[in-house]
Interface confidence: medium
């Protein structure tokens, strides 16, 4: 079910681009969009268990919507309260960086981090 | 996905089993053989950089018979790239460790990855 473009990782019928370059959250979002993908939307915290020993944090596609007073993924769906139990402590002005071992933290969206893009193939 | 076994990852025309269990170098070799694959080989620098993102440390298929022998790959070819701590006579198996190739004791328990080319 997977045929990922060069430099992308295929895993469980998804393709992931794992950057080694640091960008702001907005720059990361645009770079993913330019490759017909979106910043990582997690289904569960073991989605990236193939890199769970990584020590890096990566921008993901989660931002706070003032309109909906909720943390939303890029496709408009709401963050599950079970995904990041500490999400209530996140500063709503910030963006979310994720470590593949399951941790997330909020950082200024203007900070530069690595990022992960995701394409679903089915 | 594709032609890779379930729970393996694909990258650049290869399949990788990203292990989480620790084994000695020889046990890792056997574990990969049992999965119809080889202990991780690194064909080029780009692959090494990719693997360092995925996993900070793992055995690779490079070893030497003693500190007086050259480092070789599993198919017997000389391995020409720098392996740190090579002057230590007790460290005769190679490990990928965050963009570095280092020598380690073959009996150490270290995470292993397997690979086979599509």
């Amino acid at each position: 079910c997977c045929s990922c473009q060069e430099k992308w990782v295929g895993y469980r019928c998804n393709c992931y681009f794992i950057s080694s370059e640091q960008k702001t959250w907005n720059e990361s979002r645009h770079l993913c969009a330019s490759q017909k993908s979106s910043l990582l939307q997690l289904q569960n915290t073991d989605e990236l268990d193939f890199m769970s020993s990584s020590q890096q944090f990566y921008w993901i596609g989660l931002s706070y919507s003032e309109e909906h007073t909720a943390w939303l993924w890029e496709n408009g769906s709401a963050l599950s309260q079970y995904l990041f139990p500490s999400f209530e402590t996140f500063n709503t002005k910030n963006c979310i960086a994720y470590n593949p071992n399951g941790n997330a933290l909020d950082e200024s969206c203007e900070d530069k981090n690595r990022y992960i893009c995701k394409q679903q193939l089915i | 996905c594709g032609h890779c076994p379930e729970e393996w990852i694909t990258y650049s025309n290869s399949c990788y089993y990203i292990g989480k269990e620790r084994r000695t170098w020889e046990e890792s070799l056997l574990a990969c053989t049992s999965k119809n694959s080889s202990l991780l080989s690194i064909d080029n620098e780009e692959e090494m950089k990719f693997l360092s993102i995925i996993s900070p440390s793992s055995w690779i298929g490079v070893f030497r018979n003693s500190s007086h022998h050259p480092w070789v790959t599993m198919n017997g070819l000389a391995f020409k790239h720098e392996i740190k701590d090579s002057d230590n006579a007790e460290l005769n198996c190679a490990v990928l460790q965050v963009n570095r190739l280092k020598s380690a004791q073959c009996g150490s328990s270290i995470i292993y990855h397997c690979k086979h080319k599509l």
Partner: antibody, heavy 118, light 107 residues
Amino acid sequence: EVQLVESGGGLVKPGGSLRLSCAASGFTFSSHSMNWVRQAPGKGLEWVSAISSSSSYIYYADSVKGRFTISRDNAKNSLYLQMNSLRAEDTAVYYCAREEWGLPFDYWGQGILVTVSS
Amino acid sequence: AIQLTQSPSSLSASVGDRVTITCRASQGINSALAWYQQKPGKAPKLLIYDASSLKSGVPSRFSGSGSGTDFTLTISSLQPEDFATYYCQQFNSYPLTFGQGTRLEIK
């Protein structure tokens, strides 16, 4: 013996273009990432750009993005830096530097001066 | 971009002195730090990589330490040929960055 020799520098007017070359010898060029680093007169070192061994990964400093293009020809053992829309602040000695499989810059060229002035 | 701040910016010392130069990163870079020596009119020369690994051929009086955000280059007993400018560099992520340099002069 590893050797890196830059060429193509000189005086150019603001807005002009220049192409730097770096001829490599004494090692397997196609196995190594290569970088350009510059140093303005009396100032510190500034990384400019990097290209991986088979050109799959290319990176630029923000200060040159969109104006400079790094490339390589492994058949000719050569690294290039195409510099367009040059500015006075691009005046510097430009060095090419080799990476050893993820190690930092272990060999450098002697440098070539680029002067941007009207 | 990750910023590297070296201190001091310049330093006067005598032959035989023990000298320490520090480099602080604006965010954690694991041990992905190198130290270079540069003499006037010459290309930089790699001394230390991985924060503490001495490059082959570099005298053992040079040593490096640190991890995360704080790093140190130490010269245990200064020799006349050690008077130069020293730079730290992070290679944890792109863009790669250098410290501003530390100029080591003869007292």
